[in-house]
């Protein structure tokens, strides 16, 4: 590829560098559906934004293939626990790809936060953070799931969130 | 913009890319003021550094507008807790902007770590990690706050820290 | 340096930008050695990859000097605890450098997860996440250690992992 071609690529790269894909989505009242689906997110209001990534039904959708640092935090809390001290929470980031029918686990955490609440009326708080680099192709999607989602506490978008950026 | 202009921009970008803003600040004996203000940080010694960001009274100060991944970890611990199992810790990253009189919550976690000490040995440890992408303008500041800061344990700068880098 | 030199540097930078160093290593059955050494990691299968970094005996090895965001998560769990409720887990990222005989602590967390299990037969889960920016020279290595590693739970590479990327 000659100088002109290289020049074009550099110009292209500069422009694309200006929009290095990134997103930060925030928790909202509508995040918890109770339907067994992934968590839903705010994409525009407050701290939420999409830049070079798109969103669909809870999923960050990749438009440019590459390695991405993906992350999520969920705020957990309750008064007692639905299953008592045995309650386990699984918080994970999962990939959906057109090439495979089922979601693929990317990053997962399990926690037993309710051991902190030794009576049924005890208030407790806990938090789960996940982050890591994964390769994503254009068109692939990443979602957040929490089981048991009854223990996720939403308020103002600062305590539960989901984001990514290309590295 | 002609070839010469593009060339200058590319040279400029290459140089600025070399100093992609980043910082990592570490906990120190002076971090906990007890004054109700934000935590203070070491900016130069050991693992701490500032590159394309500045520091003022606990705050990372943005010099170049853009999207930043900001993060903080605090090491929590104690012998018992001031309010027993009801003790709640709030760890947050907050933005100060000249355009608004009050700090704005960016990323926040709440934890009830004191349930971790349930036997005669009242010693417990816990950790809180926050990270996420936010847009910051030049001149805006980010600080870390922990309530109740009596439960933050500092030692050598590896257990409690605060940082950011442009994405 | 004249236009030709600058051009070469830009071409060079574009190519190196295409391989901005990054890695994500995943937990495997062989990760826990019980030997007192660092955790070992999968580097190729599944979600694991190395790009512009190399691997040796549990260590990510830096080939290009710079600032790196390094991270690790470990999944903790058990039925009761080896030292009862007083068990403390230390999870850390450590640097090895040819210039110094001992490992240097970079990022460390301490947790007391067993307070979540109020009887010796209680199943519990917990997770520890670390991430932060550090400067690494070519040839330096980063490893993950967990004490007590008996409490680390491995399954499929999504719950315990270790990664880095240049910022």
């Amino acid at each position: 590829d000659g100088p002109a071609g290289s020049w074009e690529q550099l110009i292209q790269e500069r422009r694309s560098h200006e929009v290095n894909p990134a997103a930060h989505l925030t928790g909202a009242n509508s995040s918890l559906t109770g339907s067994g689906g992934p968590l839903l997110w705010e994409t525009q209001l407050g701290l939420a934004f999409l830049r070079g990534l798109s969103y669909h039904d809870g999923a960050l959708v990749v438009t440019k293939a590459g390695y991405y640092y993906i992350y999520s935090k969920v705020q957990l809390g309750g008064v007692g626990c639905p299953l008592g001290l045995a309650s386990t929470i699984t918080h994970g980031l999962y990939k959906r790809t057109p090439r495979y029918p089922e979601e693929l686990e990317l990053l997962v955490s399990q926690q037993s936060p309710c051991g902190r609440a030794t009576s049924s009326s005890r208030v407790w708080w806990d938090s789960s953070f996940l982050g890591g680099v994964v390769h994503l192709e254009a068109g692939e999607e990443v979602v957040v799931r929490v089981l048991d989602e009854r223990l996720v506490r939403l308020r103002d978008g600062t305590r539960s969130y989901f984001g990514a950026f290309m590295v | 913009d002609g070839p010469a202009g593009s060339w200058e921009q590319l040279i400029q970008e290459r140089r600025s890319h070399e100093v992609n803003p980043a910082a990592h600040l570490t906990g120190a004996n002076s971090s906990l003021t007890g004054s109700g203000g934000p935590l203070l940080w070491e900016t130069q010694l050991g693992l701490a550094f500032l590159r394309g960001l500045s520091y003022h009274d606990g705050a990372l100060v943005v010099t170049k507008a853009g999207y930043y991944y900001i993060y903080s970890k605090v090491q929590l611990g104690g012998v018992g807790c001031p309010l027993g199992l009801a003790s709640t810790i709030t760890h947050g990253l907050y933005k100060r902007t000249p355009r608004y009189p009050e700090e704005l919550e960016l990323l926040v976690s709440q934890q009830s770590p004191c349930g971790r000490a349930t036997s005669s040995s009242r010693v417990w440890w816990d950790s809180s990690f926050l990270g996420g992408v936010v847009h910051l303008e030049a001149g805006e500041e980010v600080v870390v706050r922990v309530l109740d800061e009596r439960l933050v344990r500092l030692r050598d700068g590896t257990r409690s820290y605060f940082g950011a880098f442009m994405v | 340096d004249g236009p030709a030199g600058s051009w070469e540097q830009l071409i060079q930078e574009r190519r190196s930008h295409e391989v901005n160093p990054a890695a994500h290593l995943t937990g495997a059955n062989s990760s826990l050695t019980g030997s007192g050494g660092p955790l070992l990691w999968e580097t190729q299968l599944g979600l694991a990859f190395l790009r512009g970094l190399s691997y040796h005996d549990g260590a990510l090895v830096v080939t290009k000097a710079g600032y790196y965001y390094i991270y690790s998560k470990v999944q903790l769990g058990g039925v009761g605890c080896p030292l009862g409720l007083a068990s403390t887990i230390t999870h850390g990222l450590y640097k090895r450098t040819p210039r110094y005989p001992e490992e240097l602590e970079l990022l460390v967390s301490q947790q007391s997860p067993c307070g979540r299990a109020t009887s010796s037969s209680r199943v519990w889960w917990d997770s520890s996440f670390l991430g932060g920016v550090v400067h690494l020279e070519a040839g330096e290595e980063v490893v993950v250690r967990v004490l007590d590693e008996r409490l680390v739970r491995l399954r499929d590479g999504t719950r315990s992992y270790f990664g880095a990327f240049m910022v």
């Epitope: - | 018992g80 001031p82 005669s120 009242r122 | -």
Partner: antibody, heavy 119, light 111 residues
Framework: QVQLQQSGAEMASPGASVTLSCKAS????????MNWVKKRPGQGLEWIGR????????NYNQKFMGKATFSVDRSSSTVYMVLNSLTSEDPAVYYC????????????WGQGTTLTVSS | DIVMTQSPASLAVSLGQRATISCKAS??????????MNWYQQKPGQPPKLLIY???NLESGIPARFSGSGSGTDFTLNIHPVEEEDAATYYC?????????FGGGTKLEIK
């Protein structure tokens, strides 16, 4: 100023129960732990346990389990200790002691309540 | 339970001299660089008074002639120069572990 006002001297029969009180003033009551300590004539100090006024949570010295029971009335900023099944081991001066800001010491004490057990 | 052993059981010190009281714990009372050891003074007919917390920190309002030192299992309370009003019984107390336990006390007499 911080004050802990304890109830007056008590005389009770063996096997009976008695309730001692400690009324706090001069600080935010729910922000500090309250401890109870026993002092028998010619002997040292013994920690009975603590109560967290914010929640009513209690921790007891195993030795006093079943003997002492703590409670709190936040509306009157008062903590209570019930001593039951009184025996000849129970006569003593009982103190309430406030947990300090760093909560692992007792920075203010009540004047003490003297308990006499006599048939 | 952690056993706190104080010595001596009693002590007579001349006015203006130094009084030194020792306290030994049956196991370490340290956590993350802090020692969970307190010292109290008790006079007859009065409640105990906090003098020193966390081994070496002087409680507000306590004269600077009182000082504490030590870590791990061995701790010391020093009073210098001793004054008339310091005649009392002194107790050490650990708070690292439940139940909190006190030393047997040291009775200080001023000569």
């Amino acid at each position: 100023q911080v004050q802990l006002q304890q109830s007056g001297a008590e005389m009770a029969s063996p096997g009976a129960s008695v309730t001692l009180s400690c009324k706090a003033s001069g600080y935010t009551f729910i922000d500090h732990i309250m401890n109870w300590v026993k002092k028998r004539p010619g002997q040292g100090l013994e920690w009975i346990g603590r109560i967290y006024p914010v929640s009513g949570e209690t921790n007891y010295n195993q030795k006093f389990m079943g003997k002492a029971t703590f409670s709190v009335d936040r509306s009157s900023s008062t903590v209570y200790m019930v001593l039951n099944s009184l025996t000849s081991e129970d006569p003593a001066v009982y103190y309430c002691g406030r947990g300090s800001y760093y909560w692992n010491a007792m920075d203010y004490w009540g004047q003490g309540t003297t308990l006499t057990v006599s048939s | 339970d952690i056993v706190m052993t104080q010595s001596p059981a009693s002590l007579a010190v001349s006015l203006g001299q130094r009084a030194t009281i020792s306290c030994k714990a049956s196991q370490s009372v340290d956590f993350d660089g802090d020692s969970y050891m307190n010292w109290y003074q008790q006079k007859p007919g009065q409640p105990p008074k906090l003098l020193i917390y966390s081994a070496s920190n002087l409680e507000s309002g306590i004269p600077a002639r009182f000082s504490g030192s030590g870590s791990g299992t061995d701790f010391t309370l020093n009073i210098h120069p001793v004054e008339e009003e310091d005649a009392a019984t002194y107790y050490c107390q650990q708070s690292i572990e439940d139940p909190w336990t006190f030393g047997g006390g040291t009775k200080l007499e001023i000569k």
